[in-house]
């Protein structure tokens, strides 16, 4: 469910939402750390209905959800965390 990507691209998110999305409707969460052309951390949520939304990393619910997923999966996430480094 959680994917972390390190890319050299500029920011992907034009607009961010803080509106809660229930876990069951989320297909994938992509985390883009700050740096490499983008000054902020970005979180992209891919939903079960094929739509995509950028979520404000400060939104309480996304922080809580990622923490819950990390805890509940106890070292193995339901989908592995992919770390891809592009020089």
């Amino acid at each position: 469910v959680l994917e972390v990507y390190y890319t050299s691209l500029r920011c992907r998110c034009v607009q961010e939402s803080s509106v809660f999305i229930p876990r069951r409707f989320i297909d994938r969460i992509q985390i883009l750390p700050r740096g490499n052309g983008c000054p902020r951390k970005e979180i992209i949520v891919w939903k079960k209905n094929k739509s995509i939304v950028c979520v404000d990393p400060q939104a309480e619910w996304i922080q809580r959800m990622m923490e819950v997923l990390r805890k509940r999966s106890s070292s193995t996430l339901p989908v592995p965390v992919f770390k891809r480094k592009i020089p």
Epitope: F20, I21, P22, R24, K48, N49, R64, L69, R72, P78
Partner: antibody, heavy 120, light 106 residues
Framework: EVQLAESGGGLVQPGRSLKLSCSAS????????MAWFRQAPPKGLEWVAS????????FYRDSVKGRFTISRDNAKSSLYLQMDSLRSEDTATYYC?????????????WGQGVMVTVSS | DIQMTQSPSFLSASVGDRVTINCKAS??????LNWYQQKLGEAPKRLIY???NLQAGIPSRFSGSGSGTDYTLTINSLQPEDFATYFC????????FGGGTKLELK
């Protein structure tokens, strides 16, 4: 007191359409995701569709995709399920339910159910 | 899609008994598992949410446990009003119910 009241059920021929309504009271309707579930004796309980707070996002079980449309009118505190191209396997009692609010709190409110029978 | 296999389908017990009902998911559901009770002609009523949290107003004789793919509902000291049908529901990825367990008086 929270109340969810479904209406619009009945007997309909295969291939025809029906629109279910759910009238909500006793809570701030627009603060909640809403859903339709159904129950048919041989198949047990099934989730049918869900809709986000403002109606901008909707989700469907595979077997109803392209045939059913979930919608809501927050001004009327009402939830709808437009059912087109009905099949005999859609025969069931349909329930309107609340899902999460903005904080992620997930209460347990169900309507009394409305019967839909698809038969020629 | 996630499948939920609930067992047993039928269960006979007496007042005062301790019973357990099991649900097995086809993949890890991260403890996003609820238990419901349903009586004839009524809507389902949630007993337990997210594996082990007791719904407000539900007696403490009901409890839930599990993780990963395997989950259990336990009813300690059955009361006459507990004879009903019980369902599990995963809400980790969309929703899937178990097939139900009909708990009958022996």
């Amino acid at each position: 007191e929270v109340q969810l009241a479904e209406s619009g059920g009945g007997l309909v021929q295969p291939g025809r359409s029906l629109k279910l309504s759910c009238s909500a009271s006793g809570f701030t309707f627009s603060d909640y995701y809403m859903a339709w579930f159904r129950q048919a004796p041989p198949k047990g309980l099934e989730w049918v569709a869900s809709i986000s707070y403002d109606g901008g996002d909707s989700f469907y079980r595979d077997s109803v995709k392209g045939r059913f449309t979930i919608s809501r009118d927050n001004a009327k505190s009402s939830l709808y399920l437009q059912m087109d191209s009905l099949r005999s396997e859609d025969t069931a009692t349909y329930y309107c339910t609340t899902e999460e609010d903005y904080s992620g709190s997930f209460p347990d409110y169900w309507g009394q159910g409305v019967m839909v029978t698809v038969s020629s | 899609d996630i499948q939920m296999t609930q067992s047993p389908s039928f269960l006979s017990a007496s007042v005062g008994d301790r019973v357990t009902i099991n649900c097995k998911a086809s993949q890890n559901i991260n403890k996003y598992l609820n238990w419901y009770q349903q009586k004839l002609g009524e809507a389902p009523k949630r007993l337990i949410y997210d594996t082990n949290n007791l719904q407000a107003g539900i007696p403490s004789r009901f409890s839930g446990s599990g993780s990963g793919t395997d989950y259990t509902l336990t009813i300690n000291s059955l009361q006459p009003e507990d004879f009903a049908t019980y369902f599990c529901l995963q809400h980790n990825s969309l929703y899937t119910f178990g097939g139900g367990t009909k708990l009958e008086l022996k």
